[in-house]
């Protein structure tokens, strides 16, 4: 806390300006009205404050807004974002779109803080849902972004946004939220043809389920192995080997290479082993042939 | 441009274990499987294993016995293997090197990282 | 697991002359999955040729492979200087994937 002290004779600030970089801390705290720094925030990020003297300016702010500062301040407050709290950006209220680019602008380049987070979380909150044009700035800044949010929260994405999603956007998804993206994907490029469907369709593929895999393999889709990898086991064990092969086209002979990674390792030991030998891929670990294979699923379920 | 860069030498007491990193940049992570390759002095290749940075799924030579354990980062783009219980033989230049999914062969390999067992 | 063998172990060749290195494997590898590499001294293992015989990018055209089965053949057409190093064959048709022991390519 910096104490109150008298602002020397001449040095009250008339504007904020590059003048008050030679001003001592106390001498800040004195001569700057808080007011005119509210309303000159603009400035501030032009000025070659050091962090100690940005700390006396966030004071100030502080002590005008203890309620949180209004988005006229909080759009231009530039590298003093840097010096806000989560606790402080809770009191925020954002709404606007070119608020949190700026702010997100300052941080550029590194991880996602703390403050960063809480800012979005209170953005996304205030606006209802995660809109297109929301998902398009966040996931330019932080491309893991999306995959950072919880099933739950996903499940707030309306497939419009779904356009807005880049494939480097989902490296980082797990299974669970392509579960969630997956029917939003579908539903929103269902009007695409074909090729064009699995271009867009494929970086979602983690949560497609069996069926939509089996459709796919009809409509010689050619999917590459890093995508047939990413796959649910659950939902390539079903497929025969004429259907992985119809689905994969040219790039089966990949199976090989992927043969004791899953789900290729787990999709194998499902196959008879004469379907195996039929690639001509010298895949090992299918059921011998003669051997009677009883899917007991289909029996719990018919029992 | 595509580059695999792995961390510096290390030198290790028998019974100890290392932990060699492989940050990787200029591709997409995931659409490549990081194999690991090691080579003693004077001695030719062996394969120790790979990972799958995209599903974490990895692949072990047996001849390890549980002694390796390789693991991902997909954030930072870059995989690690582990070796414990180390002995002398272990002393090699150990070498990341990029497979792309679906082929068995090696197109970029990191400069490789020395790790001395010595009591 | 598959063995390697590749012969010479180590061969000392005159520039512009044909070199052949063969490997001979333990069982027979699927010719897809056996491919050749390079090593130079004090330096990390490079691509030369994947498939047996598809020649890897930016390696020149005197490299060529060939073989199926057990047997397999890299032979450098007309051999320059900077070619001296040490060549592996690699399978990966079998688990675990395995390398030869290398041949030693010298320049006399």
């Known amino acids: 806390e910096v104490e109150k002290t008298a602002c020397p004779s001449g040095k009250k600030a008339r504007e904020i300006d590059e003048s008050l970089i030679f001003y001592k801390k106390w001498e800040l705290e004195a001569c700057v009205d808080a007011a005119l720094l509210a309303t000159q925030m603009d400035r501030v990020n032009a000025i070659p404050f050091t962090y100690e003297q940005l700390d006396v300016l966030k004071h100030k702010l502080d002590e005008l807004y203890p309620q949180g500062y209004p988005e006229s301040v909080i759009q231009h407050l530039g590298y003093l974002f840097l010096k806000m709290s989560p606790e402080d950006i809770r009191k925020w209220n954002v709404t606007s779109l070119e608020t949190l680019k700026a702010l997100l602008e300052v941080n550029k380049g590194h991880e996602m803080s703390p403050q960063v987070a809480t800012l979005i979380d209170r953005f996304v909150k205030g606006r209802g849902q995660l809109d297109k044009d929301t998902l398009d700035t966040l996931t330019a800044f932080y491309p893991g972004y999306l995959c950072s949010l919880s099933p739950e929260e996903l499940s707030s994405v309306p497939p419009s946004s779904i356009w807005a999603v880049r494939p480097q956007d989902l490296d980082t998804c797990d299974p669970r939220q392509l579960d969630v993206l997956y029917p939003k994907a579908r539903l929103a490029f269902q009007n695409m043809n074909g090729s064009e469907y699995f271009v867009k369709i494929q970086s979602f593929l983690g949560g497609a389920p069996t069926e939509d895999l089996k459709a796919l393999s009809q409509q010689n889709v050619s999917m590459d192995l890093a995508t047939f990898m990413k796959l649910r086991t659950d939902a390539v064990l079903p497929l025969t080997v004429a259907e992985v092969q119809k689905l994969l086209g040219p790039h089966v002979e990949g199976l090989k290479a992927e043969e004791r990674h899953r789900p290729v390792r787990d999709w194998i030991l499902r196959q008879r082993q004469d379907d195996l030998d039929t690639l001509g891929l010298g895949l090992q670990g299918g059921i011998p042939n003669g051997y009677l294979v009883l899917d007991l699923s289909m029996q719990e379920a018919l029992s | 441009e595509v580059q695999l860069v792995q961390s510096g030498a290390e030198v290790k007491k028998p019974g100890a274990s290392v932990k060699v990193s492989c940050k990787a940049s200029?591709?997409?992570?995931?659409?490549?499987?990081m194999d690991w390759v090691r080579q003693a002095p004077g001695q030719g290749l062996e394969w120790m294993g790979d990972?799958?940075?995209?599903?974490?799924?990895?692949i072990y030579n047996q001849k390890f016995n549980g002694r390796v354990t390789m693991t991902e980062d997909k954030s930072a783009s870059t995989v690690y293997m582990e070796l414990s219980s180390l002995r002398s033989e272990d002393t090699a230049v150990y070498y990341c090197?990029?497979?792309?999914?679906?082929?068995?062969?090696?197109?970029?390999w990191g400069q490789g990282t020395t790790v001395t067992v010595s009591s | 697991e598959i063995v390697l063998t590749q012969s010479p172990d180590f061969q000392s060749v005159t520039p512009k002359e044909k070199v052949t290195i063969t490997c001979s494997a333990s069982?027979?590898?699927?010719?897809?999955?056996l491919s050749w590499y390079q090593q130079k001294p004090d330096q990390s293992p490079k691509l030369l040729i994947y498939?047996?015989?598809n020649l890897a990018s930016g390696v020149p055209s005197r490299f060529s492979g060939s073989g199926s089965g057990t047997d397999f053949t890299l032979t450098i057409n007309s051999l320059e200087a900077e070619d001296a190093a040490t060549y592996y064959c690699h399978q990966w048709s079998s688990f675990p994937y395995t390398f030869g022991g290398g041949t030693k390519v010298e320049i006399k």
């Open positions: 200029g591709y997409t992570f995931t659409d490549y499987n």
């Open positions: 069982s027979s590898v699927i010719s897809s999955y």
């Open positions: 090197a990029r497979r792309r999914i679906g082929t068995g062969y090696f197109d970029v």
């Open positions: 990972i799958n940075p995209s599903t974490g799924g990895t």
């Open positions: 498939r047996t015989s």
